[in-house]
Structure formats: C-alpha cells, structure tokens
C-alpha cells in the first residue's frame, strides 16, 4: 500500500522540498513529540471488568524495537461479586501502528515502513447469541 | 537495537543503532489494511462502556485519517440496559507512531510523530474514598 | 491527599433556586469525571449529574434534567450544580464526587431541604 501523494490544494515549489530516489521517501526518525510524558490512568488494566496483561515484545531490527501487547485475562467478564460471569465476553481493543523494519540483504541494509496491529486493552462486551438448529 | 551482520564477510562497520535519517519503499508493509473501526468490529456499540468514534483527518500527516473514540458515559451499561454511575467508562489510550510531512506538503519526506489516540472504552470499579 | 470542599446548602421554598460549589484540592490531578450524587431520607443513594473533565460533557439523571446544570472551572479544580425549579422530592444530602477513573472520592455532603 503506498503513500498518497499531496492534493493539488497544496502548492509547494520543488526545490523546498529534498530531493528522494523513485519509489522511496525519506524518513527521519527523531521522533516529534517523543519526551511527551502521558498521564495514563493508574491501574485501569487491572481495575476493568475486562482486565487484560501486558507482554513487552523486542524485535533489534524494528524501531521502535519495543511494542507494547495486551492480552484480556479472561474469556468472560468480572462481575460485582468479584467473580468471572461468562454470559459476557472480554474482547480485545486493537489499533495499527507504524514501525520502520530493518531488512538484511547480504551485505547490505534497507529500511521499509510496516504497519502493526497492537492489542491495546479490552472491553466487555454483550456477545450476539444464536442459536444453531 | 543491536544487529549482527548476517554475513560475517561483510565489513563489520554497521551502526548497532537506527540511523537518524533513512530511505524506505514507498510501499507499506502489512497485512492489516487500514478500515474504518465502525466496520471492523461493533464493539463500541456492544460493549459495556460502549463509545463513539470521532473522525480526525490531517492530510499532512499519514495516516492521514484516524478515528478517535469517546466514552459514551461516565458510567457503564448494566444488566438492565441502565447506566450504572458506580462504575466507570475509562477511554484506552494508546501512544502511536504515524508520519509527518516534513518540511510541510513535501510528497516523499516525512518524520515519525508519536500521538496519543483513544482506541476505546473500558469499565472501571473505582477504589472508593470517603474525604474527611 | 485529596480534598473536597462543599458549599451551597441550604433551605428553599419549592420553585426556588440554590447552586451547590465542590472544590478539590491536594492530589487532584488526571481527572475523569466531577459530579453529585443525592441521598434522600430511607432511600439509596442516586446519581445527579456529572461532568466530564476532558470535554466537559455533561450527563443528568433524568428526574433533574432541565432543571440542573452542572459546569465547572477548569482552574480552580471547581465543579458547580446549579439547581432550579427544586421541588420537594429535591430534598436531600448532596454528595460531591471526583472520579480519577480508577479512584473515587465521596465528600462529606451538604443539606438542601426544599419546603415551604
């Protein structure tokens, strides 16, 4: 899948914009915005009555090498009770991401773009039911 | 990250770390196309703390369309089909990595931009204090 | 730790108007919500109304809707319930609630008798 190309609504004169070899872009990887410090809420993974793990996946040729993965702990959902109700599902909650993939060809290095799918959390959800004849 | 040369002829003069600036394909690698979340799944309308999905587009930015989620209540939907105001509909936030253009407008230069998107929904049993 | 200060109770002739104030302070940061629950002799204790911080959407249970209205002020941590055309099954204890998503905290409560 390739990058579209800027409309017509923009208008910028070649020469600004740095000159890049066909069928590549070029990417700079300082990232914008990369100190920005989150105030996530505390313990909402395990507080959810869908309360989902962490595993930390480390690919050396993947930036960022780090990708965070949340697996729900259980099929069902905790009710009030404290206890797993399975008349209800927890379900994972997904969202791509972009990452740069560093790729050995013999002695030489190339870089491409690849989109990961990351499971965020989850949620409780009221499964559609049917019921097989 | 750190990488060894597969070849152990080739010149050992590789950075262990990613360069600051790299050339890549204009192709994506991915199976994962990207879809609208309201297609993909009906979790936001199924779920507990269910949520809607807000449409932010940038087209200086790529993707240049993300959906952003927002809790539908403060409290989640019970048994009954009532909010129930003890418990708590909490967005899912998650930092992601998409592309800038830069400088602006520029077709094939871009830089990585780290955002915070709301994917959705989840509910919460608050730990409950009585201030004195 | 967190604190909670509520103003504004009081005794009003049916129809009439009061405006109840929470202000919280100490650790009161990463809020997800700031409301009012009411609590009316021999009966359980029901949610009012609520404001959420990142957007200020507002939510109303139903018996108030029209007549309450819930705002608040980002810089003093404050939230507001602005309270007309109370009538006498108004009467209650108001309690303020901050919710931090994960963590909820219950103010002391303050009075409003709605009589003639």
């Known amino acids: 899948r390739k990058i579209p190309k800027v409309g017509h609504t923009f208008f910028q004169k070649p020469e600004s914009c740095p000159p890049v070899p066909g069928g590549s872009m070029k990417l700079d990887i300082g990232i914008i915005n990369e100190n920005q410090r989150v105030s996530m809420s505390r313990n909402i993974e395990s507080r959810s009555t869908s309360p989902w793990n962490y595993t930390v996946t480390w690919d050396p040729n993947r930036y960022p090498s780090e990708v965070v993965q949340a697996q729900c702990r259980n099929l069902g959902c905790i009710n009030a009770q404290g206890k797993e109700d399975i008349s209800m599902n927890s379900v994972p909650i997904q969202q791509e991401t972009l990452v740069v993939r560093r790729k050995h060809q013999g002695c030489s290095v190339s870089f491409q773009l690849e989109k990961v799918l990351v499971t965020v959390g989850c949620t409780c959800v009221t499964p559609v039911i049917h019921h097989v004849q | 990250g750190i990488t060894i040369p597969r070849n152990p002829g080739c010149p050992n003069s590789e950075d262990k770390n990613f360069p600051r600036t790299v050339m890549v394909n204009l192709n994506i690698h991915n199976r994962n196309t990207n879809t609208n979340p309201k297609r993909s799944s009906d979790y936001y309308n199924r779920s507990t703390s269910p949520w809607n999905l807000h449409r932010n587009e940038d087209p200086e930015r790529y993707p240049s369309v993300i959906w952003e989620a927002k809790c539908r209540h403060l409290g989640c939907i019970n048994a009954d089909g009532n909010v129930d105001y003890h418990m708590n509909s909490v967005p899912i936030q998650q930092e992601i990595l998409v592309l800038r253009r830069e400088p602006p407008h520029c077709p094939n230069s871009f830089r990585l931009e780290k955002i915070l998107v709301s994917v959705g929904c989840t509910c919460v049993t608050p730990i409950v204090h009585h201030v004195a | 730790e967190v604190q909670l200060v509520e103003s504004g109770g009081g005794l009003v002739q049916p129809g009439g108007s009061l405006r109840l104030s929470c202000a919280a302070s100490?650790?009161?940061?990463?809020?997800?919500?700031f409301g009012w629950f009411r609590q009316a002799p021999g009966k359980e204790r029901e949610f009012v109304a609520g404001i959420r911080w990142s957007d200020a959407y507002t939510e109303y249970a139903a018996s108030v809707k029209g007549r309450f209205t819930i705002s608040r002020d980002n810089s003093k941590n404050t939230v507001y319930l602005q309270m007309n055309s109370l009538r006498p099954e108004d009467t209650a204890v108001y309690y303020c609630?901050?919710?931090?998503?994960?963590?909820?905290?219950w103010g002391q409560g303050t009075l409003v008798t709605v009589s003639s």
């Open positions: 609630v901050l919710d931090l998503s994960t963590v909820r905290y």
């Open positions: 100490g650790r009161a940061n990463s809020i997800n919500w």
